[in-house]
């Protein structure tokens, strides 16, 4: 799996989308998990409704929400009030029994708020991530 980079601004919301084959993953619940390092285990953050037919209902864990368009085949995760500690590797997963298939690997990058002048001399202009030359970046 290639890694898709999603960049958000500190304090704002970031929406992450994970497209998938709706037929292949028919009847499967989905989950969003946080990976501890590039090779680390993935810790579940939030999953879709226990009843697959109700997957369109938004489920929340703290500042993270998940909703699934099972017909269109798009899982959407929203991270509200993005903070520096939200940065890192995540995965969108499709669940079946005790197994989980990776739908997408995601790197969330948190950019400093350009309107926050506390660090005006240290404004960070995001560039390409050195570790992911071929990564796809979405804003």
């Amino acid at each position: 799996h290639n890694t898709t980079v999603f960049q958000g601004v500190e304090g704002q919301s970031l929406q992450v989308s994970c497209p998938y084959d709706s037929m292949k993953h028919w009847g499967r619940r989905k989950a969003w998990c946080r990976q501890l390092g590039e090779k680390g285990p993935c810790q579940r953050v939030v999953s879709t409704h226990n009843l697959w037919l109700l997957s369109f209902l938004r489920r929340r864990n703290g500042s993270t929400a998940i909703t699934d368009d099972t017909l269109g085949g798009t899982l959407t995760i929203t991270l509200r009030n993005l903070q520096p500690h939200d940065a890192g590797f995540y995965q969108c997963q499709s669940l079946h029994g005790s197994e989980a298939d990776t739908l997408r690997k995601v790197l969330v990058e948190v950019l400093a708020d350009p309107l926050d002048h506390r660090d005006a001399g240290d404004l960070w202009v995001p560039g390409e991530s050195e570790s992911f030359e071929d990564a796809h970046v979405e804003h």
Epitope: G37, E38, P84
Partner: antibody, heavy 120, light 107 residues
């Protein structure tokens, strides 16, 4: 018991090469990145490079590019660091270090260190 | 390469003191900073990862904070076993780089 065990101390002449080994026990090196870090006497820590044993991909600090070679043998769960064209300033303790990579690894294992002395 | 600058380079303190070590990165590194403790003749030991997360088994008197370019390691009440050298390391990009170290000595 999870540990990294390194090969013994080496004394080398300037211009020679040295190969230090690092054997993992209690875990599989494919699940980790193996880094090499060195420390000259009385000095700080210096990152040399890493290998992803699963992919065979390695990356080096610019200072060591072309002179250091990091390899891994997954069948024996051993990583190696070879440094060529040795000079006196390469005298240092060389550590191997396993983690899950950048972006928040919670795993962190270190070898006991291998002293490499370069002297004519 | 990202340069990591620690201050002070050494400090003298007494048991029970509150000790603060700072680390400045030459570029924005988000929260990708680790703190290590090293004692003479021993390998480094991870104390803090991701700027503020305490590694397993590390006493709660150690804490880390910061994001972006400025980071702090605090020892709330220095214990005899805490006299050592402390290093910060960035994990945002390769090559990984360490600060030059801060030696904490007995006053």
């Amino acid at each position: 018991q999870v540990q990294l065990v390194q090969s013994g101390a080496e004394v080398k002449k300037p211009g020679a090469s040295v190969k230090v080994s690092c054997k993992a026990s209690g875990f599989s090196i494919e699940d980790f990145y193996i880094h090499w870090v060195r420390q000259a006497p009385g000095q700080g820590l210096e990152w040399m490079g890493w290998i992803d044993p699963e992919q065979g991909e390695s990356k080096y600090a610019p200072k060591f590019q072309g002179r250091a070679t990091i390899t891994a043998d997954t069948s024996t769960s051993t990583a190696y660091m070879e440094l060529s064209s040795l000079r006196s300033e390469d005298t240092a303790v060389y550590y191997c270090h396993a983690d899950h990579g950048n972006y928040g690894s919670t795993m962190d294992y270190w070898g006991q260190g291998t002293l490499v002395t370069v002297s004519s | 390469d990202i340069q990591m600058t620690q201050s002070p380079s050494s400090l003298s303190a007494s048991v029970g003191d509150r000790v603060t070590i700072t680390c400045h990165a030459s570029q924005h590194i988000n929260v990708w900073l680790s703190w290590y403790q090293q004692k003479p003749g021993k390998a480094p030991k991870l104390l803090i990862y991701k700027a503020s997360n305490l590694h397993t088994g590390v006493p709660s008197r150690f804490s880390g904070s910061g994001s972006g370019t400025d980071f702090t390691l605090t020892i709330s009440s220095l214990q005899p076993e805490d006299f050592a050298t402390y290093y910060c390391q960035q994990g945002q990009t390769y090559p990984r780089t360490f600060g030059q170290g801060t030696k904490v000595e007995i006053k």
